[in-house]
């Protein structure tokens, strides 16, 4: 488990860091998890990349950010925001959110406390 370098991380600093990293592998990894590796997911050519590879790429990207709960929360919220319109129904939204919540642990980070993933203004 990686140790936190700071208590929280400044919000503007986190926003800049989240803007800088590539969250696509994380989005792809989660979509693969909820769609199943056999099913085709229109938005990405995911068939060529195994989910475990995407997970590693995702973790590598998240590793580029300052390891604070604040920045991790910001990244997870951005992933949710990016994929919101692609989630077809309430069940899919819940599945995506569940997988998203597991992501920090999969990458050996501490899960962010108090992180509100319902950030899409009711769209998700």
């Amino acid at each position: 488990m990686r140790r936190e370098r700071g208590r929280q991380g400044d919000s503007s600093s986190c926003e800049r860091q989240v803007d800088r990293v590539n969250l696509k592998p994380c989005e792809q990894h989660i979509m693969q998890r909820i769609m199943g590796e056999q099913e085709q997911y229109d938005s990405y050519d995911i068939r060529s990349t195994r989910s475990s590879d995407q997970q590693q790429r995702c973790c590598d990207e998240l590793n580029e950010m300052e390891n604070t709960q604040r920045c991790m929360c910001e990244a997870l919220q951005q992933i949710m925001e990016n994929q919101c319109d692609r989630l077809q129904d309430r069940q899919m939204v819940q599945q995506f959110k569940r997988e998203l919540m597991n992501l920090p642990q999969q990458c050996n980070f501490r899960a962010p406390q108090r992180c509100d993933l319902d950030v899409s203004g009711g769209r998700c």
């Epitope: 991380g9 919000s11 910001e74 108090r114």
Partner: antibody, heavy 123, light 110 residues
Framework: EVQLVESGGALVQPGGSLRLSCAAS????????MTWIRQAPGKGLEWVAN????????DYLDSVRGRFNISRDNAKSVLYLQMNTLSADDTGVYYC????????????????WGQGILVTVSS | QSVLTQPPSISAAPGQKVTISCSGT????????VSWYQQLPRTAPRLLIF???KRPSGIPDRFSGSKSGSSATLGITGLQTGDEAHYFC???????????FGGGTKLTVL
């Protein structure tokens, strides 16, 4: 029935110290975050401090950090607030509250409150 | 001066609907959950809404909560004289590592 009963409030001189206690019953104390919240006379609510279930993490309002210490005794189901170097700005009713915060993806919320105890700092 | 901004007072007639706003920033309401409290005169506050929209058991469905961006709203329908009280919003601020309360809104039922 959940009950939180504060004690230890008093009139104290500026620069003095005081220890508030909160006896909890009706729930498993060791599984909840606990929080002190205060209210100056005629004013709004002000969060003072949080303590994690096992006491390993504490957060404080900036103006009390270094002067106040929140602690707990899970064996006795008691929450404490040790207040040092008190000033007039610390005057108010202090509430002991149960915090519903869980380990991740949830927020702070205060679902049970004590009746409040008055702390007056004046010479 | 509270970081979370609420209207100081609001009034409405019995039976009407009112909304109380709570405005913050990205580091508090924008990224964290909001709760709402009712404080009747000379009593301890009581939890009305937690995690933005959830009601504890015992709170009537006349009370509702919502959040959009960096603002949250408490709605009260079918106003009753017993609803006359102060209402406070609260949330965690990730930059300050502290819970913030709004300044409070005094609701008068005319």
């Amino acid at each position: 029935e959940v009950q939180l009963v504060e004690s230890g409030g008093a009139l104290v001189q500026p620069g003095g110290s005081l220890r508030l206690s909160c006896a909890a019953s009706g729930f498993k104390f060791s599984t909840f975050y606990m929080t002190w919240i205060r209210q100056a006379p005629g004013k709004g609510l002000e969060w003072v401090a949080n303590i994690k279930q096992d006491g390993s993490e504490k957060d404080y309002l900036d103006s009390v950090r270094g002067r106040f210490n929140i602690s707990r005794d899970n064996a006795k189901s008691v929450l404490y607030l040790q207040m040092n170097t008190l000033s007039a700005d610390d005057t108010g009713v202090y509430y002991c509250t149960r915090n519903g915060l869980q380990d991740s993806y949830s927020g702070d919320f205060f679902d049970h409150w004590g009746q409040g105890i008055l702390v007056t700092v004046s010479s | 001066q509270s970081v979370l901004t609420q209207p100081p007072s609001i009034s409405a007639a019995p039976g009407q609907k009112v909304t109380i706003s709570c405005s913050g920033t990205g580091s508090n309401i924008g990224h964290n959950y909001v709760s709402w409290y009712q404080q009747l005169p000379r009593t301890a506050p009581r939890l009305l809404i937690f995690d933005n929209t959830k009601r504890p058991s015992g709170i009537p469905d006349r009370f509702s909560g919502s959040k959009s961006g960096s603002s949250a709203t408490l709605g009260i329908t079918g106003l009753q004289t017993g609803d006359e009280a102060h209402y406070f919003c609260a949330t965690w601020d990730a930059d300050l590592s502290a819970v913030l309360f709004g300044g409070g809104t005094k609701l008068t039922v005319l």
